[in-house]
């Protein structure tokens, strides 16, 4: 190899200057006793190289690129050889930004997968390989004092979420959680969350059903629907409050919300609806009296209100 490039830094802030040096060894000067070293960034020739012969007979050219505005480019030094350029050496230059502080870090405890799933927004594009690590520790108090560290959680490439498995969690005890972003230009850390995994629990929704008609029960009035639901069994012992939403299947009506439902009601008579109309209904629940996340809405139940009411029945709720 006749030439060698060295650069002040192969990775710089986008728009920053970069200085490079290309040295041609003496034993290559048979190419030309006074070779003129040329510089090229990508496909473009770059003027401004300052060339000198060093005391050991090698030739050196130094160039300063005042602003590196490409996020990725190859810088090469070359000699004119006949009618073509002879590339002596090239280096890859990268330019970008240090990682912004990851923001909107939030977590939820999934009791089905027994894991704490945390997600965040990584911030603007850095144009550089940037790694994100979810870091955490156990804490007896309010996360001012750090207890046992928990194994780092590294998301798959391109993902902005990570799952901490149950074996690294302690329920009913606080954890300090934050995201660290790192690339060649720097490191940043999100603000720390301090949470008990159970306080971010997300339940599965109940399963909505139509109430089985019984001979002694009064049939629903016109404009009423009798509903029941089966709680999500693994969350049975968690106090919950729930809410229903409904809308007519036909037309453009938006969802109407009903709730909170009477605590522990597993059946409900919903009234004030249009008679002889098909409705779509869904239910969702949240841990009650303690923090938590709303469940997703349940699968839809489709029911039709009755045609007209028998005159002797009164509207009532089941508690």
């Amino acid at each position: 190899e006749c030439g060698h490039i060295s650069v002040s830094a192969p990775i710089v802030h986008l728009g920053d200057p970069i200085t490079a040096s290309c040295i041609i060894k003496q034993n290559c000067s048979h190419l030309d006793p006074e070779p003129q070293i040329l510089w090229r960034l990508g496909a473009e020739l770059q003027p401004g190289g300052r060339q000198q012969r060093l005391s050991d007979g090698t030739q050196e050219s130094i160039i300063t690129l005042p602003h590196l505005n490409h996020t990725q480019a190859f810088l090469s030094c070359a000699l004119n050889w006949g009618n073509s350029l002879q590339i002596l050496d090239q280096v890859e230059l990268r330019a970008g930004y240090p990682p912004a502080i990851p923001h909107n870090l939030s977590c939820l405890m999934n009791l089905t997968t027994s894991s704490l799933i945390c997600q965040w927004e990584p911030g603007p594009e850095t144009h550089l390989p940037t790694s994100f690590t979810l870091k955490s520790f156990k804490s007896r108090g309010n996360c001012q004092t750090q207890g046992d560290s928990i194994l780092d959680c590294v998301p798959k490439d391109g993902q902005s979420h990570c799952s901490i498995p149950r074996k690294h969690l302690l329920l009913y005890q606080n954890m300090g959680i934050w995201v660290q972003a790192e690339n060649a230009l720097g490191t940043s850390m999100s603000p720390q969350l301090c949470l008990d995994p159970m306080d971010v629990v997300k339940l599965e929704p109940p399963m909505l059903r139509t109430m089985d008609p019984s001979p002694e029960a009064a049939p629903p009035q016109a404009g009423c629907l009798q509903l029941s639901w089966e709680p999500w069994q693994p969350g049975l012992h968690i106090n919950q409050k729930c809410e229903l939403r409904h809308k007519p299947q036909r037309g453009e009506a938006s969802w109407a919300l009903v709730g909170p439902l009477p605590l522990e009601a597993l059946q409900y008579e919903l009234c004030g609806l249009l008679p002889a109309t098909a409705y779509t209904l869904q239910i969702r629940c949240i841990r009650w009296a303690l923090p938590g996340h709303w469940s997703d809405w349940s699968p839809s139940l489709e029911l039709r209100t009755t045609e007209r009411a028998p005159t002797h029945h009164h509207h009532h709720h089941h508690h």
Partner: antibody
Framework: EVQLLESGGGLVQPGGSLRLSCAAS????????MGWVRQAPGKGLEWVSS????????PYADSVKGRFTISRDNSKNTLYLQMNSLRAEDTAVYYC???????????WGQGTLVTVSS | DIQMTQSPSSLSASVGDRVTITCRAS??????LNWYQQKPGKAPKLLIY???NLQNGVPSRFSGSGSGTDFTLTISSLQPEDFATYYC?????????FGGGTKVEIK
């Protein structure tokens, strides 16, 4: 300190009835599920019934369904188990326990012995 | 109903031994598995909840692991006060069910 104290056990003839009570203290009783677990002499543990915080949900073991009724009085911080149509196989120590959110029992009362015999 | 099968039903061990008790569920129960210790004439005491969470005040020599259908309670170094009967219990769905128990005796 959380404490649970059962009472009401004793000797009863087959077909008879008994009402067990469990007095709770040291925690907000009205926020927790409660349950009864029994243990026949020399045998393992068997869940009997549980009751939700407001009393609206009351699952039972098949072996006692239709004969036993669980209830609670949140104003008195007391859990009950009404046992009717008692059988010899209902003979056991009956424990009341507070249920954790994910269904574990902690703590337990000291237990009360129910003997069904003629 | 979910059946819980504990093994062994009894074991003999010495102080300082590492002891492992297993519990198998007849169907998947995620992490809804709890472990209890019971000494003769006493009420059971919760050791581990949700498969691996150590209850407050329980010595760290007790640990729980597993998920789905297979679970393990491990006592890393058996102490004289650990000789007792141990029960697993599933809380995934009602009826709540217990394993048959494992009696840990002095060798």
């Amino acid at each position: 300190e959380v404490q649970l104290l059962e009472s009401g056990g004793g000797l009863v003839q087959p077909g008879g009835s008994l009402r067990l009570s469990c007095a709770a203290s040291g925690f907000t009783f009205s926020l927790y599920w409660m349950g009864w677990v029994r243990q026949a002499p020399g045998k393992g543990l068997e869940w009997v019934s549980s009751i939700s915080s407001s009393g609206g949900v009351t699952p039972y073991a098949d072996s006692v369904k239709g004969r036993f009724t669980i209830s609670r009085d949140n104003s008195k911080n007391t859990l009950y188990l009404q046992m009717n149509s008692l059988r010899a196989e209902d003979t056991a120590v009956y424990y009341c326990a507070k249920l954790g959110e994910l269904g574990w029992f902690d703590p337990w009362g000291q237990g009360t012995l129910v003997t069904v015999s003629s | 109903d979910i059946q819980m099968t504990q093994s062994p039903s009894s074991l003999s061990a010495s102080v300082g031994d590492r002891v492992t008790i297993t519990c198998r569920a007849s169907q998947g129960i995620s992490s809804y598995l709890n472990w209890y210790q019971q000494k003769p004439g006493k009420a059971p005491k919760l050791l581990i909840y949700y498969a691996s969470n150590l209850q407050n005040g329980v010595p760290s020599r007790f640990s729980g692991s597993g998920s789905g259908t297979d679970f393990t309670l491990t006592i890393s170094s058996l102490q004289p006060e650990d000789f007792a009967t141990y029960y697993c219990q599933q809380s995934y769905s009602t009826p709540l069910t217990f394993g048959g128990g494992t009696k840990v005796e002095i060798k």
